[in-house]
């Protein structure tokens, strides 16, 4: 069963390399566990960035070592990816599964295009 | 190792109400649904409902509502059903179980069960 | 509500033969994500019940290879290559596709 999911269409990652979107998803039941998940595409491969399950009123925790971190209000999934690089810069989509109570939905956003510039490294000073 | 220990056996009268607890241990609470499940005597196994220990979200079946309200007191790690205007087809044993999303949501742990016995 | 219809009521099983426990649901339970929302439980005599198969086809842990499950999306079956003594109890198939979640009748199995 198909869900809507919104994302903004582009973010600009900071200067350290750091960018934020929230996924907002229109929940069609009473969703108690939601699983998001960050996908990169680039050309036309689609790579697992990051992924987390929630249970709702519980913090949303990404695997030790994930670049993603997020937070959880409501229908809303804040989304913040560290540590990246100009070589990064992609359509990063957002996946959320509602995963329980039954029944099982799923919907895909139309990603997030993130830039990412390298910061011009600093001249040296005499 | 992961407990669910559940109240003592209770006898009740008609139109009484009752409330069945089931403390969780060995592992972190707030982390698992918990089911309720109703099986009356020499039956079979019924869905009640399930409650989320972080914010006492509810869904239940709707046979039950109206009957059974499902509570936890996540300082204590435990879980409660309450049975209200008791009649005789209550009379049942009620288990509480954990949800496990490693197996899809399916009860992995349950508690002993608690014997209610509806009697005038 | 889905339905869950077991067959047999019943199932005497001399220790070491094989035995197979039906399991009916009004409604498929394969989704769309491919995930067969089907679960085997067993109620051994005096004891709580215990979790032997979730998503159709998955032994939970502890539990022995000598039992399997197979289906499609509406039929199930429930296998037992050898049967042990530890065995007998009722099997109830289940189902979480839909709230409410729903159980069979339960087939009890004895040893002859």
């Known amino acids: 069963k198909a869900m809507h999911v919104a994302q903004p269409a582009v973010v600009l990652a900071n200067s350290r390399g750091t960018a934020s979107f929230v996924c907002e998803y229109a929940s069609p039941g009473k969703a108690t566990e939601v699983r998001v998940t960050v996908l990169r595409q680039a050309d036309s491969q689609v790579t697992e960035v990051c992924a987390a399950t929630y249970m709702m009123g519980n913090e949303l925790t990404f695997l030790d070592d994930s670049i993603c971190t997020g937070t959880s209000s409501g229908n809303q999934v804040n989304l913040t990816i560290q540590g990246l690089r100009a070589m990064d810069t992609g359509l990063y989509i957002c996946k959320v599964e509602l995963m329980y109570p039954p029944p099982y939905y799923m919907g895909i956003g139309n990603g997030t295009q993130i830039y990412v510039i390298d910061p011009e490294p600093c001249p040296d000073s005499d | 190792q992961v407990q669910l220990v559940q109240s003592g056996a209770e006898v009740k009268k008609p139109g009484a109400s009752v409330k069945v607890s089931c403390k969780a241990s060995g592992y972190k609470f707030t982390d698992h649904f918990i089911n309720w499940v109703k099986q009356a005597p020499g039956q079979g196994l019924e869905w009640i409902g399930d409650?989320?220990?972080?914010?006492?979200?509810?869904n239940s079946n709707q046979k039950f509502e109206g009957k059974a309200t499902l509570t936890v007191d996540k300082s204590i790690s435990t879980a409660y059903m309450e049975l209200r205007r008791l009649r005789s087809d209550d009379t049942a044993v009620y288990y509480c179980?954990?949800?496990?999303?490693?197996?899809?949501?399916?009860?992995?742990?349950w508690g002993q069960g608690t014997l209610v016995t509806v009697s005038s | 509500d889905i339905v869950m219809t077991q067959s047999p009521l019943s199932l005497p099983v001399t220790p070491g033969e094989p035995a197979s426990i039906s399991c009916r649901s009004s409604k498929s339970l394969l989704h769309s994500n491919g995930i067969t929302y089907l679960y085997w439980y067993l109620q051994k005599p005096g004891q709580s019940p215990q979790l032997l198969i979730y998503?159709?086809?998955n032994l939970a842990s502890g539990v022995p290879d000598r039992f399997s499950s197979s289906g499609s999306g509406t039929d199930f079956t429930l296998k037992i290559s050898r049967v042990e003594a530890e065995d007998v109890g009722v099997y109830y198939c289940a189902q979480n596709l839909e709230l409410p979640l729903t159980f069979g009748g339960g087939t009890k199995l004895e040893i002859k």
């Open positions: 409650i989320n220990p972080n914010n006492g979200g509810t």
């Open positions: 179980a954990r949800l496990r999303r490693e197996y899809f949501y399916a009860m992995d742990y």
């Open positions: 998503q159709m086809s």
